[in-house]
Interface confidence: medium
């Protein structure tokens, strides 16, 4: 089941998926001047069985000016650099993505890939938030959001994170007005079935991430 809305927006924060749940789709987008090969896939799909998950379909781009198809090759270093990447660098990788059952790791780049990747998340996906440069985190709880199915509708849980400017005098989190959950639903709502998968293992993964450092490369 695809998540049919966006993860919550936290002022001065961005978020990242550390691994992608089976069912996640990644658009096959090509950079300017290139297009998908005629019979090429629209998207890559994270699929798997109980022991192994991987991305089905290959994205392939060809020059818009020619009719020839390009072969799937690993980009040269300068081509890889062209793509704006956002990676997690940490002295201690939180969890090897391949070891997270039912999840795929970040797919490798393909030749002439677009500068931006477009993912379509599924129920059970977890994303992790961090404050952007120049802001620091005030935690009231986990800085993550999970896509859940509630009353037959998907929604994202509200991350308990406030990002405050380093120069600002920081208040205790309790003094700040709490942000509303998406669609105004309180997080304590338990009146109906909530479907999430792998929650236990994802929570453990989040715990290991506490000391992780995220860095964003800007061009």
């Amino acid at each position: 089941e695809l998540c049919d809305d966006d993860p919550p927006e936290i002022p001065h924060a961005t978020f990242k998926a550390m691994a992608y749940k089976e069912g996640t789709m990644l658009n096959c987008e090509c950079k300017r001047g290139f297009r998908r090969i005629k019979s090429g896939s629209l998207y890559m799909l994270c699929t798997g069985n109980s022991s192994h998950s991987s991305w089905d379909n290959q994205c392939q781009c060809t020059s818009s000016a020619t009719r020839n198809t390009t072969k799937q090759v690993t980009p040269q270093p300068e081509e890889q650099k062209e793509r704006k990447t956002t990676e997690m660098q940490s002295p201690m990788q939180p969890v090897d993505q391949a070891s997270l059952p039912g999840h795929c790791r970040e797919p490798p780049p393909w030749e002439n890939e677009a500068t931006e990747r477009i993912y379509h998340f599924v129920v059970g996906q977890m994303v992790y938030y961090q404050c952007v440069q120049g802001y620091r985190a005030l935690h009231r709880g986990p800085a993550e959001s999970v896509c859940k199915m509630t009353h037959g509708k998907t929604r994202w849980t509200q991350p308990q994170l406030i990002c405050t400017g380093e120069m600002e005098t920081s208040q205790f989190p309790g003094e700040e007005k709490p942000q509303a959950s998406p669609e105004g639903r309180p997080e304590s709502e338990t009146s109906c079935l909530v479907t999430t998968t792998d929650f236990q293992i994802q929570t453990e993964m989040a715990a290991t991430m506490e000391t992780s450092i995220f860095t964003t490369e800007y061009q």
Partner: nanobody, 131 residues
């Protein structure tokens, strides 16, 4: 690549309403793009942010000069975005541009407000508000 076509521009009386549409087309999957509106007033070099909406229509962001008069929404097919402005003023006269942005890596914030963050642009539609 995505193509954007604006429509609905023209002349409107001050105090009236304005409704612009932007149709997105191109070989892509589902709701892949956030959409925004910018405007360029006569004699101005910069395109000014008007408002934006996230790819599923969950979030919107409006510029201060118009936020009490503006609604941006997405059509059911998600490939159309609408700008509805009420109580128009002569200073709303401008060329209005529809723009689209993709979601950057697996890291992104949901509504973009700066023109540099937009990857695709329409040709623009002229709106003239006369007093």
């Amino acid at each position: 690549q995505v193509q954007l076509v604006e429509s609905g521009g023209g002349s409107v009386q001050a105090g009236g309403s304005l409704r612009l549409s932007c149709e997105a087309s191109g070989p892509t999957l589902f709701s892949s793009y956030g959409m925004g509106w910018f405007r360029q007033a006569p004699g101005k070099k910069e395109r000014e942010f008007v408002g934006a909406i996230s790819r599923y229509g969950t979030y919107t962001s409006y510029a201060d000069p118009v936020k009490d008069r503006l609604t941006i929404s997405r059509g059911n097919a998600k490939s159309t975005v609408y700008l509805q402005m009420n109580n128009t003023k002569p200073e709303d006269t401008a060329v209005y541009y529809c723009a689209a942005y993709t979601y950057s890596g697996s890291f992104y914030s949901t509504v973009k407000t700066h023109h540099d963050e937009y990857h695709y642009w329409g040709q623009g539609t002229q709106v003239t508000v006369s007093s």
